[in-house]
Interface confidence: medium
Amino acid sequence: LEVQVPEDPVVALVGTDATLCCSFSPEPGFSLAQLNLIWQLTDTKQLVHSFAEGQDQGSAYANRTALFPDLLAQGNASLRLQRVRVADEGSFTCFVSIRDFGSAAVSLQVAAPYSKPSMTLEPNKDLRPGDTVTITCSSYQGYPEAEVFWQDGQGVPLTGNVTTSQMANEQGLFDVHSILRVVLGANGTYSCLVRNPVLQQDAHSSVTITPQRSPTGAVEVQVPEDPVVALVGTDATLRCSFSPEPGFSLAQLNLIWQLTDTKQLVHSFTEGRDQGSAYANRTALFPDLLAQGNASLRLQRVRVADEGSFTCFVSIRDFGSAAVSLQVAAPYSKPSMTLEPNKDLRPGDTVTITCSSYRGYPEAEVFWQDGQGVPLTGNVTTSQMANEQGLFDVHSVLRVVLGANGTYSCLVRNPVLQQDAHGSVTITGQPMTFPPEA
């Protein structure tokens, strides 16, 4: 029995759902009562999911797996793995038995984008040319381990005196801290780039060191200027910091996070105590870091509805506040391509090619092109529908008159993640070929 799986690893973002594709060719007269299907971890042989005696036997893997019951009879034995974790990374084997046996293994590569790096400076005041300063670049909650690059304002790499450490948290996600020691010139810009090698995602930050301005009376509250981009289902850190004076104690601190527009309370800290979340119990502070002036808020299991501006209010003796924007994103799935009609095609026939990509956010940009890379703009209709979670399903329809043969490609772009998902179909005399779905 021939069992087919994708050759390339399936790349899945932490917190999202992944489909491990597996298929077999059912013979005529095949019924589900004949099927025995087992998914297991290749290395340990730990059972993940099974189907036997015409029934889905359910998940044996943290209740996070599911089959596609309506597609089994057509030979689709794929496994859906929900809320992917770092610990899920590895090889899964799909065993199929009808009368004969067959099996194949598919690799799951887990990834998580790194946050925009935060930069700190030590010492951070009264700096003069010739002083040695330590610049720390910190980026959080990524996977796998990052590559870190430093450069100066002219783009020249800085390699000397760099120490980078990467620590995995309980979820296996890495926090990266890279320290650069430099002797200051008159002024200078220092940039840090944190690269995710699997996602080919780069997160940049830079610090320009100039003479410090004198402090004002109010508490200076600092938040990132750029929106925090968070993937649906993952956790996001909304950074907020203040500079505690010598002798500062948490008993003096009043901290409030709220939604900027509606002023709805999100989280608070007062009287030396974390007063907890008022926002769906999905927020947390960093209690161990508050005394150092870190008032950041952790927002768990981000949803589309969380997008918007959050204000961080800090009061010690004086008041200060600043707002940080949360931009929510979700990658679009690899497009599936369908053809209508899909047989007995001849040059001159008009065909409708549909490109469908699912569960992305925000709305996608869709581009069509032919085999030579020439854009196809005429006779394209694209619709985008949001589901209950606010995620968009994109359906783009291209009507073309066939030449002798041709390749038609569809590109679905997520404008926030700058993520492109491609699908293509090649139409020849007979038969037609669809590239295998990853």
Epitope: Q264, T270, E271, Q275, G276
Partner: antibody, heavy 117, light 112 residues
Framework: EVQLVQSGAEVKKPGSSVKVSCKAS????????MHWVRQAPGQGLEWIGL????????NYNEMFKNRATLTVDRSTSTAYMELSSLRSEDTAVYYC??????????WGQGTTVTVSS | DIVMTQSPLSLPVTPGEPASISCRSS???????????LRWYLQKPGQSPQLLIY???NRFSGVPDRFSGSGSGTDFTLKISRVEAEDVGVYYC?????????FGGGTKVEIK
């Protein structure tokens, strides 16, 4: 001495709105949360929601979320509770109460709101 | 929502005698910060409620030491060691660990 002085009794028609005020003195108004609680005749106490005067942050009891609006005027140290789409079962004494986010120590004298056609 | 159940509903007392009121919550009142936000209020006839006990067992300023609170988790008790005539009114327990904050139905204390 902490004092919370509320506005006078109101008689309202069903479907209308009422706005109750609560003027605070004797403490730093901006620094403490203001809660609102109501008590229907012969009944127990029911928490409506709270507001932080400095930031304007609010947190409502879901039961009142679409009808109650809590606001403050920091310049006069006054908190307000507006309840819309009134019905007869909203007839009650409405209290403001000052304290922290997780408690309330000092109560106003109460404002009687009667809803009757 | 957390349901707070008080007993008894009515408590006739003799001055100088002790009195005890029970309050039970439908869920633990231990907050994520490990404190327990259970309070006791007294509402005297024609007045606003006044705070007696906060965080289970702490007397509010100016409250006589004949009032004491105890309990943990879901079961709590208010005790008056020697009832005085001025103690009459309705006693309420209240939780503010979980939103929405909720109150017990009240216990009416009256002199026999």
């Amino acid at each position: 001495e902490v004092q919370l002085v509320q506005s006078g009794a109101e008689v309202k028609k069903p479907g209308s709105s009422v706005k109750v005020s609560c003027k605070a003195s004797g403490y730093t108004f901006s620094s403490y949360w203001m809660h609102w609680v109501r008590q229907a005749p012969g009944q127990g106490l029911e928490w409506i929601g709270l507001i932080h005067p400095w930031s304007g942050s609010t947190n409502y009891n879901e039961m009142f979320k679409n009808r109650a609006t809590l606001t403050v005027d920091r310049s006069t140290s006054t908190a307000y509770m507006e309840l819309s789409s009134l019905r007869s079962e909203d007839t009650a004494v409405y209290y403001c109460a000052g304290g922290g986010r997780l408690y309330f120590d000092y109560w106003g004298q109460g404002t009687t709101v009667t809803v009757s056609s | 929502d957390i349901v707070m159940t008080q007993s008894p509903l009515s408590l006739p007392v003799t001055p100088g005698e002790p009195a005890s009121i029970s309050c039970r919550s439908s869920q633990s009142l231990v907050h994520s910060n490990r404190d327990t936000y259970l309070r006791w209020y007294l509402q005297k006839p024609g007045q606003s409620p006044q705070l007696l006990i906060y965080k289970v067992s702490n007397r509010f300023s100016g409250v006589p030491d004949r009032f004491s609170g105890s309990g943990s988790g879901t079961d709590f008790t208010l005790k008056i060691s020697r009832v005085e005539a001025e103690d009459v009114g309705v006693y309420y327990c209240s939780q503010s660990t979980h939103v929405p904050y909720t109150f017990g139905g009240g216990t009416k204390v009256e002199i026999k």
